[in-house]
């Protein structure tokens, strides 16, 4: 059963007002809807012990010699900050104790590409998707997820690191993204706005959205997340909207209600297991697909993105606690977590359906610009 | 035999404190997660709080209604669980029940074990 | 907070006789359901888990069924002993909560 939360088929951009033009001009970002240039990246940071690698938190190595094959903090290396800076973008900051830990935020120095210089690199998420300009591959199969239905027991790590919440996941949930593409489910995490101002980090035709979700995911290829980085298809993000609707999503109301336990920064507590599926669009057929970058340092590229094209709907209460319950550093609100939209330079974005054909209501005439990359993959 | 003992009930007056503790015995106290559950008078069950075992590092978890009065905790060098309820009102007047709960090899709260209960009367 | 509703509230029924009884969940619980027995001055005892999982010494008599938010309680063939009350208790989620409990009488 899936509680009736999604919107059921309205392309990507459509509220549950069902208007026509749900992209229109009032939807477009004024300048406070997209963080400027020093309204940086993304928030995955490189957290406490614990914690499990992922576009989040991207612990530092330990030796290898410690469980060599179980995915721990130590799964991702140290970000180094390079002396030179470079374009002051996306700005992080470091701790005052000068840890190795690059401890950064979004506004404020230095320039990401300083605490990573891969922040610097071509290929960077988030990014603006224009269906019209998708490549549409009818090769992208519809989504494989396995065991993401899980027990209340054992429960699970939710944990405030002072750029998102993030949920720890446990062994044992796959994802495919097609024949001879899986993966395995690491953590999730949530990007919002403040009151009033949309937070998503993709944007589609320019319209932010209030929230998204990230769902990161290792390659069964790789042992750890450390040799996974930067390497094409190493890691994998599902990214769904977060829309407002008329009704309270049980699903997420399991997370939202334990915010305020975790308020202050760096605070964690526990939560039972729960349907992680049911906190994603329940169609699985329809998204977009690039390569990318994690949108926190360390920015590492060959990212895979699926981004889907329904989006999940949350009351207005549970939007408003999202995004006003949780602290930051230096006793801010944890608010506007999300990284500018970057270049595309040259990529194509590849939809799994024809989007460009008849989902997108603002066309006066398809374009289908692209062809599909994917195909024969 | 794997049981549940529970002592510390009485009659107290609103306002008042009183702690109830809980006895072990017959399994491995330490791996389990130990929750109360209290039963008004002609009333059905309601779950009152549980602490999590030494592996999920001894934390609590409270129903709304208790929650800021009372304070579960644990000895495990002892076998024994405790429930210290503060600022009492008339509605926490109920039998309570010292319960087992879910472990490491399990993977779904339920409650398979109840001790016999104790009773807590709160009146003027 | 995760409502449970049993019913019926009363029933009543003849030695031998197969009932059943309902819980209806407010939200999707998947099969995190428990039943338990409580007979007058005792504490309560777990009957099934996991929706249909008979507990360890519970007679055959009784079987649990259902998932998401329909469950049910049957008792095969009443025993004088089973003329007590029953509750059902959702495990998905915290506040654990009870169904307000179903009385079985002798007709």
């Known amino acids: 059963q899936r509680l009736p939360r999604m919107q059921e088929d309205s392309p990507l951009g459509g509220g549950s007002s069902g208007e026509d033009d749900p992209l229109g001009e009032e939807d477009l970002p004024s300048e406070e809807d997209s963080p400027r240039e020093e309204d940086p990246p993304g928030e995955e940071d490189l957290p406490g012990e614990e914690d499990l690698p992922g576009e989040e938190d991207l612990p530092e190595v330990k030796p290898k010699s410690e469980e060599e094959g179980s995915l721990k903090l130590e799964d991702l290396p140290t970000v180094e900050a390079p002396g030179d800076p470079q374009e002051p973008q996306n700005n992080a900051h470091r701790d005052k104790e000068g840890d190795d830990q690059s401890h950064w935020r979004y506004g404020g120095d230095p320039p990401w590409p300083r605490v990573s210089p891969a922040c610097a690199g071509r290929f960077q998420s988030p990014v603006d998707i224009r269906p019209q300009l998708a490549a549409f591959c009818p090769a992208l199969r519809p989504l494989e997820l396995l065991g993401f239905q899980l027990p209340p027991l054992p429960e699970l790590r939710l944990r405030n690191n002072g750029h998102s919440v993030q949920l720890t996941l446990p062994p044992g949930l796959e994802m495919a993204l097609g024949p001879g593409r899986e993966y395995r489910a690491l953590q999730l995490h949530l990007h919002w706005g403040a009151a009033g101002r949309p937070g998503s980090e993709h944007t589609v035709e320019g319209h932010r959205f209030p929230a998204e979700i990230h769902v990161v995911h290792l390659s069964t290829a790789f042992a750890r997340v450390d040799e996974a980085l930067g390497r094409p298809g190493g890691l994998a993000v599902l990214a769904a909207f977060l829309e407002e609707g008329p009704e309270e999503n049980s699903a997420y109301e399991q997370l939202l209600s334990r915010l305020e336990e975790i308020a202050e920064e760096g605070s964690e507590t526990q939560v039972p297991g729960l349907d992680i599926s049911a906190l994603l669009p329940s169609d699985f057929s329809r998204y977009f697909q690039y390569e990318g970058s994690l949108t926190t340092p360390p920015c590492a590229q060959g990212v895979i993105w699926t981004v889907f094209n329904q989006t999940v709907m949350l009351s207005a209460k549970q939007l408003h606690t999202l995004s006003d319950t949780l602290w930051g550093p230096g006793d801010s609100r944890l608010q506007l977590n999300f990284r500018a939209t970057q270049p595309l330079n040259g990529r194509v974005i590849e939809a799994s359906f024809p989007a460009g054909v008849d989902s997108s209501p603002r066309a006066a005439e398809p374009v289908q610009l692209n062809s599909c990359l994917a195909a024969g993959d | 035999e794997v049981q549940l003992v529970e002592s510390g009930g009485g009659l107290v007056q609103p306002g008042g404190s009183l702690r109830l503790s809980c006895a072990a015995s017959?399994?491995?106290?330490?791996?389990?997660?130990m929750h109360w559950v209290r039963q008004a008078p002609g009333k059905g069950l309601e779950w009152v709080a549980f602490i999590r075992n030494k592996a999920s590092g001894y934390t609590p978890q409270y129903s709304a209604s208790v929650k800021g009065r009372f304070t579960i905790s644990r000895d495990d060098s002892k076998n024994s669980l405790y429930l210290q309820m503060n600022s009492l009102k008339i509605e926490d007047t109920a039998v309570y029940y010292c319960?087992?709960?879910?472990?490491?090899?399990?993977?779904?709260?339920?409650?398979?074990?109840w001790g016999q209960g104790t009773t807590v009367t709160v009146s003027s | 907070d995760i409502q449970m509703t049993q019913s019926p509230s009363t029933l009543s029924a003849s030695v031998g006789d197969r009932v059943t009884i309902t819980c209806h969940v407010s939200?999707?619980?998947?099969?995190?359901l428990s039943w338990y027995q409580q007979k007058p001055g005792n504490a309560p005892k777990l009957l099934i888990y996991?929706?249909?999982n008979l507990h360890t010494g519970v007679p055959s008599r009784f079987s649990g069924s259902g998932s998401g938010t329909e469950f049910t309680l049957t008792i095969g063939s009443l025993q004088p002993d089973d003329f007590v009350t029953y509750y059902c208790q959702q495990g998905q989620s915290y506040p654990f909560t009870f169904g307000q409990g179903t009385k079985v009488e002798i007709k």
């Open positions: 319960v087992r709960g879910g472990h490491a090899g399990s993977n779904y709260w339920y409650f398979d074990v």
């Open positions: 996991q929706a249909s």
């Open positions: 017959g399994f491995t106290f330490t791996d389990y997660y």
């Open positions: 939200q999707n619980i998947n099969v995190w």
